[in-house]
C-alpha cells in the first residue's frame, strides 16, 4: 500500500503552501525506501537516495516555480511514481447569507472569503436550535443536524424545505480543500430573513367616466404558498409621468383605486409586498405598470401637483354611481392566527 495519504482532490496531486516547506511523497514505494527525485523532463537530480529522507522530497520555502510534475525512482531505476505539486492556501471561513421568499423554505448562499487556488468543495448542513430548560434536558427533541441539499450544477446554494416559521436554525457551511477545512456558522430565523418576491400581474386600468381615477390590481407572487396560513400586505406607489415624487398608499387587499390621479397624464404604478404581521422586510418593487385615467369631464385647469390631494374630483355628468369596489377582506380560513408554540 502507498505510504502517501491521499488528500481530497484529483489523484496523483500533492499540495503545499507558498512560502512554506513542502514534502512530496513517492507513492509507489514502501515507506522509508530511499528514492531519487527528478523534475519531469529534466535530467538534473533534485535529491538522491542518500539524503536520509527515504521516500520523501523536501522543498524548502516552496514558490510558484516549484509547481509541476516530479518523478521518483527506486535504487534499481524503476519508476516509483509521478507526483504533481500544486500550491495554494488552506480554506478560510466562507461568507454565508440566507434568504426566504416564503415562510416555509429558505436558501443559503456562500462564497469564499479568500481564494485558495486549490480544488474546493463545500459541506452544508443545518440544525434546529433549541435551548433546553432544566426539566426538559433529559429528553432532547430531534434537532438534526441534517444535510442542506445543494443545488445541482455547482451553484453555491442550498435549500432548507419545510422550515418552521417560529424556530431558529443554525447553518454550517464548511469549505474543504486538500489543505484543510474551515467552517462558518450562521443563525437564521425565518421571521427575520423573510422577504417575499414582488407581487405579480400588476395591471393599471382607467375607470370609465372618472378622469381622476385609476384602478390597480395585482396577484400574490407565485413563490408564496397557494393556500397561505400567513397573508401578505401591500404597499402601492404611483406618480404621473415626469413627476419625480411617488405617492404611497397601503391597500387593503389585491386592488387599489387611486382617486387623485392627474387627468390626462399617464401614471406609473408599482407595488411591494410584506408579511401581514411585519415579519422580515418589504419585497423589492414590482416592475412598473402604466395607465392613463379615462377622458371624461376634465377640470377647468390641471392643479399644481402640491394641490392634488385637495382638488375635488369632477364627477361625470351622467348620473351613474361610482363603480363598486370589491370586498378585499381575506377569506376567513386565511386569517392569520399565529400562536407562538
Amino acid at each position: 500500500s502507498s505510504p502517501c495519504p491521499q488528500a481530497w482532490g484529483p489523484p496523483g496531486v500533492q499540495y503545499g503552501q507558498p512560502g512554506r516547506s513542502v514534502k512530496l511523497c513517492c507513492p509507489g514505494v514502501t515507506a522509508g525506501d530511499p528514492v531519487s527525485w527528478f523534475r519531469d523532463g529534466e535530467p538534473k537530480l533534485l535529491q538522491g537516495p542518500d539524503s536520509g529522507l527515504g521516500h520523501e522530497l523536501v522543498l524548502a520555502q516552496a514558490d510558484s516555480t516549484d509547481e509541476g510534475t516530479y518523478i521518483c525512482q527506486t535504487l534499481d531505476g524503476a519508476l516509483g511514481g509521478t507526483v504533481t505539486l500544486q500550491l495554494g492556501y488552506p480554506p478560510a471561513r466562507p461568507v454565508v447569507s440566507c434568504q426566504a421568499a416564503d415562510y416555509e423554505n429558505f436558501s443559503c448562499t456562500w462564497s469564499p472569503s479568500q481564494i485558495s487556488g486549490l480544488p474546493t468543495r463545500y459541506l452544508t448542513s443545518y440544525r434546529k436550535k433549541t435551548v433546553l430548560g432544566a426539566d426538559s434536558q433529559r429528553r432532547s427533541p430531534s434537532t438534526g443536524p441534517w444535510p442542506c441539499p445543494q443545488d445541482p450544477l455547482g451553484a453555491a446554494r442550498c435549500v432548507v424545505h419545510g422550515a418552521e416559521f417560529w424556530s431558529q436554525y443554525r447553518i454550517n457551511v464548511t469549505e474543504v480543500n486538500p489543505l484543510g477545512a474551515s467552517t462558518r456558522l450562521l443563525d437564521v430565523s425565518l421571521q427575520s430573513i423573510l422577504r417575499p418576491d414582488p407581487p405579480q400581474g400588476l395591471r393599471v386600468e382607467s375607470v370609465p367616466g372618472y378622469p381622476r381615477r385609476l384602478r390597480a390590481s395585482w396577484t400574490y407572487p407565485a413563490s408564496w404558498p397557494s393556500q397561505p396560513h400567513f397573508l401578505l400586505k401591500f404597499r402601492l406607489q404611483y406618480r404621473p409621468a415626469q413627476h419625480p415624487a411617488w405617492s404611497t398608499v397601503e391597500p387593503a387587499g389585491l386592488e387599489e383605486v387611486i382617486t387623485d390621479a392627474v387627468a390626462g397624464l399617464p401614471h406609473a404604478v408599482r407595488v411591494s409586498a410584506r408579511d401581514f404581521l411585519d415579519a422580515g422586510t418589504w419585497s423589492t418593487w414590482s416592475p412598473e405598470a402604466w395607465g392613463t385615467p379615462s377622458t371624461g369631464t376634465i377640470p377647468k385647469e390641471i392643479p399644481a401637483w402640491g394641490q392634488l390631494h385637495t382638488q375635488p374630483e369632477v364627477e361625470p355628468q351622467v348620473d351613474s354611481p361610482a363603480p363598486p369596489r370589491p370586498s378585499l377582506q381575506p377569506h376567513p380560513r386565511l386569517l392569520d392566527h399565529r400562536d407562538s408554540v
Epitope: R127, V131, Q137, S140, R170, S182, T183, L185, L186, D187
Partner: antibody
C-alpha cells in the same frame, strides 16, 4: 438523554497540573459551544473558559489565562481543560456546560449555558 | 472582567414577587442582549432560567421573567414558592476575548 459527565478532578499540589474531561452524550456535540465554569467552596459561579464548535476559537477568564487550556475532540464527544501551575485559589467544583451560542454573519457570541454536568472537585493543597 | 453586581440577598413570602438586579457596564450587560439567569440549589448544578434577556427555555415556569434597562438586567420571580428558595446568578457575554462573566449571586429566601 442529554448529559455531560465530568471527570479528572482530585487533589493536586500547588504548581501541579491536572486535566479535566467532560464526556457529552445525547446531542450532536460538534455543533455546540462548550465551556467550563467553577465554584469555590461557599462562593459564587466563575466563568473559566469557552470554546467554539470547531475548536478554532477559545476564550479565558483573566484569572486562568496562560495557565489553563481548553480543547475538544469532536470525534470523541469530549471537552477538556488542561490546568497547569495550579494555585490554592483554583480549588473549586468545575462544571462543564453546553451553550447554543449565537452566530451572526460576522461573529459568534457566548449566549447561555443550558446543560450542565454534575461537577468535579479540584483541590489544590500541599 | 469584573463580576456583575447583584444584591447579596432578597426575600418574600409565598405568593409574593421578588426582583433581583444585575448591574454591569456598557461592555457587557448594556452592550449585548446576551444576559442569562441561573438558579442553583445547595449542592446541585445551576439550572438555566432565562436567556437572551427575556427568553425562557422549555420547561421553565412563566413565573420567572427577565428584563433589561441600560446596564442593569433584572429577574422577577412572581408567585413565590418554597422551592424558589435558592441562589440566583446572572451572566452576560463579556464583549472581549470570547469571554463571559457571572454576577456575584443573590440568595433568595422564601419567608414563613
Amino acid at each position: 438523554e442529554v448529559q455531560l459527565l465530568e471527570s479528572g478532578g482530585g487533589l493536586v499540589q500547588p504548581g501541579g497540573s491536572l486535566r479535566l474531561s467532560c464526556a457529552a452524550s445525547g446531542f450532536t456535540f460538534s455543533w455546540y459551544f462548550m465551556g467550563w465554569v467553577r465554584q469555590a467552596p461557599g462562593k459564587g459561579l466563575e466563568w473559566v473558559s469557552y470554546i467554539y464548535p470547531s475548536g478554532g476559537s477559545t476564550g479565558y477568564a483573566d484569572s486562568v489565562k496562560g495557565r489553563f487550556t481548553i480543547s475538544r475532540d469532536n470525534s470523541k464527544n469530549t471537552l477538556y481543560l488542561q490546568m497547569h501551575s495550579l494555585r490554592a485559589e483554583d480549588t473549586a467544583v468545575y462544571y462543564c456546560a453546553r451553550d447554543e451560542g449565537y452566530c451572526s454573519s460576522t461573529s459568534c457570541y457566548f449566549d447561555a449555558f443550558d446543560i450542565w454536568g454534575q461537577g468535579t472537585m479540584v483541590t489544590v493543597s500541599s | 472582567q469584573s463580576a456583575l453586581t447583584q444584591p447579596p440577598s432578597a426575600s418574600g413570602s409565598p405568593g409574593q414577587s421578588v426582583a433581583i438586579s444585575c448591574t454591569g457596564t456598557s461592555s457587557d450587560v448594556g452592550g449585548y442582549n446576551f444576559v442569562s439567569w441561573y438558579q442553583q440549589h445547595p449542592g446541585k448544578a445551576p439550572k438555566l432560567l432565562i436567556y437572551e434577556v427575556t427568553k425562557r427555555p422549555s420547561g421553565v415556569p412563566d413565573r420567572f421573567s427577565g428584563s433589561k434597562a441600560g446596564n442593569t438586567a433584572s429577574l422577577t420571580v412572581s408567585g413565590l414558592q418554597a422551592e424558589d428558595e435558592a441562589d440566583y446568578y446572572c451572566s452576560s457575554y463579556g464583549g472581549s476575548n470570547n469571554a463571559g462573566v457571572f454576577g456575584t449571586g443573590t440568595k433568595v429566601t422564601v419567608l414563613g
